[in-house]
């Protein structure tokens, strides 16, 4: 007996071939001997089966001695043995229909779990193997679970159902809702405008929810809410914003915040959370602000940074086009009695300059100029 695997909702063609390459009488029946369809001359006739409105054949193939049964919009309960009667012969085809669905919405938050459930006909014993977009394989029976979804799990999951040495492939599109970056650092000189961007790693037709940016300044003992906002159909509206600092927010995606000035008291780290409508849990992105200030007081040239810096970062003071006078893995460096000229304060990581501030040191009788 021939075995054919089908997918729920799909269309399947069950073939039946006669030895004569011409249109002759044929009938398709189910295992209960109920007629599904057949022909009467050139006409297609249908029986009283539950497949009536979903069963079809192809007249153009009859002349070739092919008498297919085509079943549209397959259901699990269509799984059955179908019998084609042609030329006093009976051809049996066993159809097994499977369905594979995601337990919940296919749009899941980063860190959540994905469960795939296999619907199968009674008496079948299929095995399932799924491959994620990043190439991770998972195997199971009726259910497959993946915990702690990551951004790389977004995309098409390909699942293969095996039964009777036959296979049927399912493709399920999964969207992991997350920000493009888990964390980012902005390096700014004191007084500069600061731009924070929070691009999303997914696109959806409509996006509705609410969000908030909590900020922990390095100099502060506790964190505070800097801004709260609503998101409606990808339009951003500010609900509440602190007076100091007075953040500005873009009205369109990606989420965009502007801090008018980088000041040492703002240096620190923030956590932007976004709660999406009809989703449990929130999206998070950490953002860090590092602020640099270079000053000259009397005979002391000082360079300082505030904010979350890594211990491997190097802070240096050097006279332009000369070797560094001082270079330390610390958050403040200084030079006593600096020579006149343009001094550079550099924050660097393995030789790569992250932040630079210039200060002009005038001869000792005049006051310093900060460009």
């Amino acid at each position: 007996k021939k075995v054919v695997l089908g997918k729920k909702g799909d269309t399947v063609e069950l073939t039946c071939t006669a030895s004569q390459k011409k249109s002759i009488q044929f009938h398709w029946k189910n295992s209960n001997q109920i007629k599904i369809l057949g022909n009467q001359g050139s006409f297609l006739t249908k029986g009283p089966s539950k497949l009536n409105d979903r069963a079809d054949s192809r007249r153009s193939l009859w002349d070739q001695g092919n008498f297919p049964l085509i079943i549209k919009n397959l259901k699990i309960e269509d799984s059955d043995t179908y019998i084609c009667e042609v030329e006093d012969q009976k051809e049996e085809v066993q159809l097994l229909v499977f369905g594979l669905t995601a337990n919940s919405d296919t749009h899941l938050l980063q860190g959540q779990s994905l469960t795939l459930t296999l619907e199968s006909p009674p008496g079948s014993s299929p095995s399932v193997q799924c491959r994620s977009p990043r190439g991770k394989n998972i195997q199971g029976g009726k259910t497959l679970s993946v915990s702690q979804l990551e951004l790389q799990d977004s995309g098409t999951w390909t699942c293969t159902v095996l039964q009777n040495q036959k296979k049927v492939e399912f493709k399920i599109d999964i969207v992991v809702l997350a920000f493009q970056k888990a964390s980012s650092i902005v390096y700014k000189k004191e007084g500069e405008q600061v731009e924070f961007s929070f691009p999303l790693a997914f696109t959806v037709e409509k996006l509705t929810g609410s969000g908030e940016l909590w900020w922990q300044a390095e100099r502060a003992s506790s964190s505070k809410s800097w801004i709260t906002f609503d998101l409606k159909n990808k339009e951003v509206s500010v609900k509440r914003v602190t007076q100091d600092p007075k953040l500005q927010m873009g009205k369109k995606l990606p989420l965009h915040l502007t801090l008018p000035q980088a000041l040492p008291q703002y240096a620190g780290s923030g956590n932007l959370t976004l709660a999406l409508e009809a989703k449990t849990g929130k999206l998070h992105q950490e953002v860090n602000l590092v602020v640099m200030r270079a000053t000259q007081l009397q005979k002391n040239l000082t360079c300082e940074v505030w904010g979350p810096t890594s211990p491997k970062l190097m802070l240096s003071l050097k006279l332009e086009n000369k070797e560094a006078k001082v270079s330390k893995r610390e958050k403040a460096v200084w030079v006593l009695n600096p020579e006149a000229g343009m001094w550079q304060c550099l924050l660097s990581d393995s030789g790569q300059v992250l932040l630079e501030s210039n200060i002009k040191v005038l001869p000792t009788w005049s006051t310093p100029v900060q460009p």
Epitope: G6, T11, V12, S42, D56, R59, D63, I71, K72
Partner: antibody, heavy 115, light 107 residues
């Protein structure tokens, strides 16, 4: 709802090979036949041929010697190649889904053959 | 090949009119016939199949009849959006063939 999206070269020189591909989105690829049809002012609508998921083909005898239709089930795509084209092959080419009737069509591709 | 001949090749009518288009097959095709509507710049759209069955979403003012060699498409009360070209197609045998089309124009 099934959607068919087609693409391929639009301008050819005589004797070249016409090549078009059609991708099927949002519907069953199995169980159906996937056809190519062309439409020219001179000949009206002309069925070129068809293929199913298994690669079984049927061609219009008038074009059979020059036509190859192939399928890539991994991508839910099928393709048309028509060799040795002449100005008479200038037409809008459509891909379509069929059992007996063409119930879903691609957007059409204008192919011009000119020296 | 089965030849499909449509008549008339063009027809002028007004909104609200009843219009009938005929299609004749060069040999018997039982009820293996479909009707399509095509508007300029668009692909044909299936209206009627099996000679008289409606494709989902097709307004009930369209109807099809016939069997064997002679078939008709009737539009009971023309609407502005019905002005288009109509084609018949046989699915009885390979190669599938279409009629040459009937252009329905505003009078």
């Amino acid at each position: 709802q099934v959607q068919l999206q087609q693409w391929g070269a639009g301008l050819l020189k005589p004797s070249e090979t016409l090549s078009l591909t059609c991708a099927v989105y949002g519907g069953s690829f199995s169980g159906y036949y996937w056809s190519w049809i062309r439409q020219s002012p001179g000949k009206g609508l002309e069925w070129i041929g068809e293929i199913n998921q298994s690669g079984s083909t049927n061609y219009n005898p008038s074009l059979k010697s020059r036509v190859t239709i192939s399928v890539d089930t991994s991508k839910d795509q099928f393709s048309l190649k028509l060799s040795s084209v002449t100005a008479a092959d200038t037409a809008v080419y459509y891909c379509a889904r069929v059992i007996n009737w063409f119930d879903s069509w691609g957007q059409g591709s204008l192919v011009t053959v000119s020296s | 090949d089965i030849q499909m001949t449509q008549s008339p090749s063009s027809v002028s009518a007004s909104v609200g009119d009843r219009v009938t288009i005929t299609c004749r097959a060069s040999q018997g095709i039982s009820s293996w016939l479909a009707w399509y509507q095509q508007k300029p710049g668009n692909a044909p759209k299936l209206l009627i199949y099996d000679a008289s069955s409606f494709q989902s979403g097709v307004p009930s003012r369209f109807s099809g009849s016939g069997s064997g060699t002679d078939f008709t498409l009737t539009i009971s009360s023309l609407q502005t959006e019905d002005f288009a070209t109509y084609y018949c197609q046989q699915a009885n045998s390979f190669p599938y063939t279409f009629g040459q089309g009937t252009k329905l124009e505003i009078k």
